[in-house]
């Protein structure tokens, strides 16, 4: 979370960003709020990056202003037009590049001052894991895929009964660069699984956090997963 | 839940002054404007002016300027709309509404002038 | 001031007509008009903003379109609940100003 002020006294305003990260051929929302106003026609909303000659994006006196805005970003941008009033500066990008990590600005002017605040955006790939058992293994082996993630994550298995155990000798992981030759598709292979147990999958890099989980018993299989963002620290 | 309850129902004499409060619960008070708007019989809704309680940000529509004061007790989460001088098309249901969408509105106040 | 012309004031038509109620902004608002329903004795609650943007919880018969100066707001399939007053009303610059209304009766 990063809050930004103004110039000073009255005439500043609050500009709160939070750091995000974006998923490449996704599309991404770059996180921004300011103190509203009660009127349209004074909002003025800027997003420049970095590095960047032209704006990323701009909206003032109540509709989209485009003619600066740099190529890279032409057509791939918007904000959320009914919650501009409401202080709402959100920028939504669409077809989120490789090149478009940066630091950005979200630069406000409203009737009652000006304020500004950076923003860390993060891209690369990142999904949900799936863990199967694979029963064309010669051994109760469990399998854990996940299509895309960029740039190259760890892959760690764990389990509920065997906490703390390392499972790099009994684990075989492997990355295929997919068709597009940026993102690879993460499969990883546990051997040696025990009945009653359940199992996790956890693939980290420096973006996301995601984990599969499995409990197999002898009547069922059970199957869980969920993926976080690693947003940078408060600043 | 957001709510935005109301002071119940005034007779005033012309020439009085008239406080209508509204208290705001279910959302944060102070990030949101707080706007004040009235109902006259068989007349559209006319826009009174509004407050940013986070800063005590002040509008208010010329035609009601020095006759009206807004003002919020932001440590009771409660705006204050006071209107004086009052003659007898000042009669009318008055509303607090939540942000500049207007998003969400109170029950309404009726305050009747007369002599 | 910005005046809102309403159209028409009152209406009536049957359970399952197309209802279109216009509004016409003095001066060019851009899309900074909300629409709002009020019933009876009751408040008026936010049905559509910035233009064509359906509120929270809003069913998917009501919505609205234009730009500038002039606004459309739909109702696709009227029904009985609907029986209100609409209202229209431009954030683009103040005195926000309103609509003077469009009471929808059922035949």
């Known amino acids: 979370l990063i809050i930004g002020f103004g110039i000073s006294g009255r005439h500043s305003i609050t500009v709160t960003t939070v750091a995000s990260a974006g998923n490449i051929g996704e599309d991404g929302i770059l996180s921004c709020t300011f103190e509203p106003d009660i009127k349209l026609s004074d909002i003025v909303i800027q997003w420049l990056k970095e590095g960047v000659l032209g704006l990323v994006h701009e909206f003032k006196e109540g509709k989209d202003e485009l003619s600066e805005q740099d190529e890279m970003f032409r057509g791939r941008t918007a904000v959320f037009a009914d919650q501009v009033i409401v202080g709402n500066a959100s920028l939504r990008l669409k077809n989120v590049q490789l090149t478009d990590a940066g630091t950005y600005k979200c630069y406000i002017i409203t009737s009652k001052g000006k304020g500004n605040a950076n923003l860390e955006y993060k891209t690369g790939a990142f999904s949900m894991p799936e863990v199967n058992v694979d029963y064309n293994a010669s051994s109760e082996t469990l399998r854990c895929e996940a299509p895309r993630w960029f740039p190259q994550p760890t892959v760690v298995w764990a389990s509920q009964v065997d906490q703390g155990a390392n499972f790099s000798e009994v684990s075989n992981t492997s990355f295929e660069l997919n068709s597009e030759n940026v993102t690879m598709k993460v499969v990883s292979v546990l051997y040696n699984v025990t009945i009653n147990n359940t199992y996790s999958c956890m693939i980290e890099n420096d973006i996301a956090k995601a984990t599969g989980d499995i409990k197999v018993t002898e009547s069922e299989i059970k199957r869980r997963s969920h993926l976080q963002l690693l947003n940078s620290k408060a600043s | 839940e957001v709510q935005l309850v109301q002071s119940g129902a005034e007779v005033k004499k012309p020439g009085a002054s008239v406080k209508v409060s509204c208290k705001a619960s279910g959302y944060t008070f102070t990030s949101s404007w707080m706007n004040w708007v009235r109902q006259a019989p068989g007349q559209r809704l006319e826009w009174m002016g509004g407050?940013?309680?986070?800063?005590?940000?002040?509008e208010y529509n010329e035609k009601f300027k020095g006759r009206v004061t807004i003002t919020v007790d932001t440590s009771a989460s409660t705006a204050y709309m006071e209107l004086s001088s009052l003659r007898s098309e000042d009669t009318a249901v008055y509303y607090c509404a939540r942000d500049s969408r207007f998003s969400y509105w109170g029950q309404g106040t009726l305050v009747t002038v007369s002599s | 001031d910005i005046v809102m012309t309403q159209s028409p004031s009152s209406l009536s038509a049957s359970v399952g007509d197309r209802v279109t109620i216009t509004c016409k902004a003095s001066q060019d608002v851009r899309t900074a008009v909300a629409w709002y329903q009020q019933k009876p004795g009751k408040a008026p609650k936010l049905l559509i903003s910035?233009?064509?943007y359906r509120y929270t919880g809003v069913p998917s018969r009501f919505s609205g379109s234009g730009s500038g100066t002039d606004f459309t707001f739909t109702i696709s399939s009227l029904q009985p609940e609907d029986i209100a007053t609409y209202y229209c009303?431009?954030?683009?610059?103040?005195?926000?100003?309103f609509g003077g209304g469009t009471k929808v009766e059922i035949k």
């Open positions: 407050i940013y309680p986070n800063r005590g940000n002040i």
């Open positions: 910035s233009t064509s």
């Open positions: 009303q431009q954030h683009y610059s103040t005195p926000l100003t």
